[in-house]
């Protein structure tokens, strides 16, 4: 009996036309939502004038439906048993699941000012930037609508630059009508233990953002894993959102709509400093902000963002060192709300429920040549927003899963 089930599972999780896995893989049957909480800055003037702690108040959720588009350019390669594809991006606002509208206003860090002052450190260039920033009446902070902040707005300061520069700024700009990839993953035909594992991303096996092993593209995209998952396993996956591979470890058994699943979580060790977790040495890319690589819980992904000083963390700086959150007032990290988990059905390796949580932060530094930054006396890693991307298997799919997979085994 067991061998027959194993044989059936192995057949059905292969990523090729006609299998259960393929159908759900091409277009997820799960409704996926991305909730945003924006950190509204309460004291912009005090920060700019006196280098005070930044007082933030989170506002949300603002919810979008995501991952509803089928994978594109799906191409099988029989020679190396891989399938390549693009994952198109799309987001639809869900007013009924949101606390307000996309037109709601927020006081947030001025993304262009923070980025330009970081990218162009030459003193003379900073004086020119100062002229452009002041001329455009830009400041250290700005008021933007949710739609502008997420999906893009024409920045008045960048619009003054007479060279061809991108004048549109947004945390997720461009998003709609774009795609992530090309991904090339193993289809599992020759070796089921490699199914869904990424072979190449954008044509490469490495990212070119990090040194050494940190630069590797490991595991799957977390939507599924090779079948027959063991509790002792460390599940590796790659997330283009954070420009790196990461891992999850078993935490507990969970019953999801009558289906026994394993809950895997991202451990605090994954965010530790190299002092505590030597494997993380290559995620420390500079010495000053990281206080000689002793700070933890924030990831500098500027190399992946054209030099813009973007730092990724867990929401509310969960698992981050005290020095990171010290200049920010109003944060309340807690594991239950702010950690990332994957609920994996161990036989098939399918992720039946997940909550991916991350926070987008921007570094802003003092600059004696830029008027709106010259009163700052310290660096700030400023939280802009955090997101919670969730998906849960639907009741109908769960019934089918129970009858066809877990029911047969039990």
């Amino acid at each position: 009996g067991d061998l027959l089930i194993q044989k059936t599972i192995k057949k059905q999780v292969v990523l090729e036309e006609g299998t259960i896995a393929f159908k759900n893989w091409v277009k997820t049957g799960t409704e996926v939502y991305r909730q945003f909480w924006i950190f509204d800055v309460q004291n912009p003037q005090e920060v700019m004038m006196n280098s005070s702690n930044i007082q933030v108040k989170q506002r949300g959720p603002y919810t979008y439906r995501v991952r509803f588009l089928a994978k594109e350019n799906v191409t099988q390669d029989a020679e190396d048993n891989t399938v390549s594809f693009l994952q198109p991006n799309g987001a639809i606002f869900e007013p009924s699941l949101s606390v307000g509208t996309e037109a709601d206003n927020f006081t947030v860090l001025n993304l262009a000012v923070a980025a330009a002052s970081h990218i162009y450190q030459n003193q003379f260039v900073q004086m020119i930037l100062n002229s452009l920033i002041n001329k455009s009446k830009s400041s250290m902070f700005q008021v933007r609508t949710l739609r502008e902040l997420l999906w893009g707005y024409r920045d008045p300061f960048l619009s003054l630059v007479p060279y061809p520069v991108t004048t549109t700024v947004g945390l997720f700009y461009p998003y709609n009508n774009t795609a992530d990839g090309v991904y090339k993953v193993f289809n599992g035909k020759d070796n089921i233990s490699k199914v869904a594992i990424i072979d190449t991303y954008k044509g490469k096996r490495n990212l070119s953002y990090w040194e050494s092993h940190c630069d590797m593209i490991n595991g799957t995209d977390a939507a599924s894993f090779p079948p027959f998952v063991e509790k002792s396993q460390v599940l590796q996956f790659f997330s283009s959102d954070i420009c790196r591979s990461i891992y999850a470890v078993f935490e507990s058994d969970v019953n999801l709509k009558g289906i026994p699943v394993y809950r895997f979580v991202l451990p605090s060790k994954a965010f530790a400093s190299p002092v505590e977790n030597p494997d993380n040495y290559c995620f420390c890319t500079e010495k000053i902000i990281s206080k000689n690589c002793t700070s933890y819980g924030v990831l500098d992904i500027s190399k992946c963002k054209e030099g813009r000083p973007v730092y990724i963390s867990l929401p509310h700086f969960l698992y981050a060192s005290p020095d990171v959150s010290e200049p920010i007032d109003g944060l309340n990290p807690n594991e239950e709300e702010h950690r990332t988990y994957l609920d994996i059905e161990p036989i098939t390796g399918f992720t039946l429920q997940f909550a991916k949580r991350l926070q987008v932060n921007l570094l802003v530094k003092p600059s004696e040549k830029i008027q709106v930054l010259k009163n700052l006396k310290r660096n700030y890693i400023v939280p802009i927003l955090w997101l919670n991307e969730t998906g849960t298997i639907g009741d109908e799919k769960a019934n089918m899963f129970r009858s066809q997979v877990t029911g047969k085994i039990n």
Epitope: Q45, F124, M127, I128, N130, S131, L132, I133, N134, K135, K137, S139, F141, L160, V161, P162, Y163, Q371
Partner: antibody, heavy 122, light 111 residues
Framework: QVQLQQSGSELRSPGSSVKLSCKDF?????????MSWVRQKPGHGFEWIGD????????IYGEKFEDKATLDADTVSNTAYLELNSLTSEDSAIYYC??????????????WGAGTTVTVPS | DIVLTQSPASLAVSLGQRATISCRAS??????????MHWYQQKPGQPPKLLIY???NLESGIPARFSGSGSRTDFTLTINPVEADDVATYYC?????????FGGGTKLEIK
């Protein structure tokens, strides 16, 4: 002492063009401070023509002057230029260059040239 | 364009008295806690001279007899006490929005 030195008066016939110059003696501030051009017609108020950030040549024009004026700057000689084309008697005025407050770029002018009188007979 | 209306068009004040000139903007000239309204003095045959910047800041070298106040759309230049050397035309100017615009001027005379 003179900080902005403007070129001398100009008499031009209708339909012609004229190029006015404004030399800045502060070579440190010139590249990083917006230089504006403002005109004052006899018995009238002031009209802002536009401005230029010399270091990168970034210009903004008042809508009224978009087809009338061209701003330019040379960071070697620290000189800003205003060219006016298709002159009519309506363009007769005193033209001032005015530098933004020590590179603050907030649009107020602490240094002005003495002005150049342009006369276009009707 | 933002229209600046100055009043009065002219005023005569006795030496040692207070002169008050008003400037009203057709829309707010405030951004990020700053009022981008400035005041100049112009004497015949001379270029304008900056007196007050950003509504209330006194330009260096300008006597403290000159002061500015106001926000959003209503601004005032005050000269107290008036001296003989203050005979001139006074202009307000906004730089909150391109194109920058000037008021029509207020001519100050001594009674």
């Amino acid at each position: 002492q003179v900080q902005l030195q403007q070129s001398g008066s100009e008499l031009r016939s209708p339909g012609s063009s004229v190029k006015l110059s404004c030399k800045d003696f502060d070579s440190e501030v010139f590249p990083i401070a917006y230089m504006s051009w403002v005109r004052q017609k006899p018995g009238h108020g002031f009209e802002w023509i536009g401005d230029i950030l010399p270091s990168i040549g970034s210009t903004i024009y008042g809508e009224k002057f978009e087809d009338k004026a061209t701003l330019d700057a040379d960071t070697v000689s620290n000189t800003a230029y205003l060219e006016l084309n298709s002159l009519t008697s309506e363009d007769s005025a005193i033209y001032y260059c005015a530098r933004d407050y020590y590179g603050s770029s907030y649009g107020y002018f602490d240094v002005w040239g003495a002005g150049t009188t342009v006369t276009v007979p009707s | 364009d933002i229209v600046l209306t100055q009043s009065p068009a002219s005023l005569a004040v006795s030496l040692g008295q207070r002169a008050t000139i008003s400037c009203r903007a057709s829309e707010s000239v405030d951004s990020y806690g700053n009022s981008f309204m400035h005041w100049y003095q112009q004497k015949p045959g001379q270029p304008p001279k900056l007196l007050i910047y950003r509504a209330s800041n006194l330009e260096s070298g300008i006597p403290a007899r000159f002061s500015g106040s106001g926000s959003r759309t209503d601004f005032t230049l005050t000269i107290n006490p008036v001296e003989a050397d203050d005979v001139a035309t006074y202009y307000c100017q906004q730089s909150n929005e391109d194109p920058y615009t000037f008021g029509g001027g207020t001519k100050l005379e001594i009674k």
